[in-house]
Interface confidence: low
């Protein structure tokens, strides 16, 4: 069974950025270079993450917090805490295991990451296509054909949605 730490445990007094050094009579010692402890009472410090290769440092390691990485331009983060970098593609493409591939007809991708998605089917909502789709943009649906009968007021197409954020270039 796990023994509960006694209230007198001297290690509980060691703040973040230090560790309880068993080799020095449980004195609170500062974390060595390139290591950190983010909570108090730690018996060891953790090694700082190194942002190498396609990773670049977004936040330097400190004695109390780990380094944070992002990706070099032309790549974007994947996974928790940016555990991987994946190559950007151009708008109108998706990344396959053999590189960037143009979206098939009837699909689009308006970002530099992610997959190609099907164009909206306007007819499912009883609407008509106002602006045709492209590899980079979804179709714009307009009023239903019945609404376009003579005498009906003209309809202004909706403003395009703001483009989603991209990886830094």
């Amino acid at each position: 069974f796990e023994r509960t730490r006694s209230l007198q445990d001297p290690c509980s007094n060691c703040p973040a950025g230090t560790f309880c050094d068993n080799n020095r009579n449980q004195i609170c010692s500062p974390c060595p270079p390139n290591s950190f402890s983010s909570a108090g009472g730690q018996r060891t410090c953790d090694i700082c993450r190194q942002c190498k290769g396609v990773f670049r440092t977004r936040k330097e390691c400190s004695s109390t917090s780990n380094a944070e990485c992002d990706c070099t331009p032309g790549f974007h983060c994947l996974g928790a805490g940016c555990s991987m970098c994946e190559q950007d593609c151009k708008q109108g493409q998706e990344l396959t295991k053999k590189g960037c591939k143009d979206c098939c007809f009837g699909t689009f991708n308006d970002q530099k990451r992610g997959i190609c998605r099907p164009w909206t089917n306007c007819s499912l909502d009883g609407k008509s296509v106002l602006v045709n789709g492209t590899k980079e943009r979804d179709v714009v649906c307009g009023p239903s054909p019945a609404d376009l009968s003579p005498g009906a007021s003209s309809v202004t197409p909706p403003a395009p949605a703001r483009e989603p954020g991209h990886s830094p270039q």
Partner: antibody
Framework: QVQLVQSGAEVKKPGASVKVSCKVS????????IHWVRQAPGKGVEWMGG????????IYARKFQGRVTMTEDTSTDTAYMELNSLRSEDTAVYYC???????????????????WGQGTLVTVSS | DIQMTQSPSSLSASVGDRVTITCRAS??????LNWYQQKPGKAPKLLIY???SLQSGVPSRFSGSGSGTDFTLTISSLQPEDFATYYC?????????FGQGTKVEIK
């Protein structure tokens, strides 16, 4: 890790064809994107073409269109480059190279050539 | 096609020297720029990808910088094994194109 091993040197007469092979080991050919690059004696590096996305025909440099054919045999993990109507200026070392392949397991893919085959010298002479 | 221009085409340097090679693209290529080293009779070897990322196993004396149209490969302290020809290559668009090469020779 992936390795590319090419077929041996060839000597051909003008007008003939040559077919160079590139055997993949360490990974399967279907996991890779193989490109072909050539280098004439004392000259720079020239991309000939290669396989980009999945399930699509290879893309060829304009200069070689109609003369080059690139194929893959996934059953033997071997890529091939055939060049027809050879002329003396086709004398060069021909390399296969893997594109967009992360050889070191860090979870990335990108547009660079690594690793390369050892090269195949093709000499065209009458 | 995107044209890649390297300078100088050749240079003479001594062991321990700091060497800089530049590569200019005819249009913006973001960070899609790679550097290779080639020794006589050998295939090119990838040194730097994505303009500034050091390929695994490549010594840290090699570094790359730049984005857009202007890029630099720097060897901080030239070693005997670094005498070779260096090529830049853009992968922003098809066809991928290479610079004409920079030969680094012993002074």
């Amino acid at each position: 890790q992936v390795q590319l091993v090419q077929s041996g040197a060839e000597v051909k007469k003008p007008g003939a064809s040559v077919k160079v092979s590139c055997k993949v080991s360490g990974y399967t050919l279907s996991e890779l994107s193989i490109h072909w690059v050539r280098q004439a004696p004392g000259k720079g590096v020239e991309w000939m073409g290669g396989f980009y996305p999945e399930d699509v025909e290879p893309i060829y440099a304009r200069k070689f269109q109609g003369r080059v054919t690139m194929t893959e045999d996934t059953s033997t993990d071997t890529a091939y480059m055939e060049l027809n109507s050879l002329r003396s200026e086709d004398t060069a070392v021909y390399y296969c190279a893997a594109e967009g392949f992360d050889n070191y397991g860090s979870g990335i893919r990108g547009n660079w050539f690594d690793p390369w085959g050892q090269g195949t010298l093709v000499t065209v002479s009458s | 096609d995107i044209q890649m221009t390297q300078s100088p085409s050749s240079l003479s340097a001594s062991v321990g020297d700091r060497v800089t090679i530049t590569c200019r693209a005819s249009q913006s290529i973001s960070s899609y720029l790679n550097w290779y080293q080639q020794k006589p009779g050998k295939a090119p070897k990838l040194l730097i990808y994505a303009a500034s990322s050091l390929q695994s196993g490549v010594p840290s004396r090699f570094s790359g910088s730049g984005s857009g149209t202007d890029f630099t490969l720097t060897i901080s302290s030239l070693q005997p094994e670094d005498f070779a020809t260096y090529y830049c290559q853009q992968s922003y668009s098809t066809p991928p194109t290479f610079g004409q090469g920079t030969k680094v020779e012993i002074k």
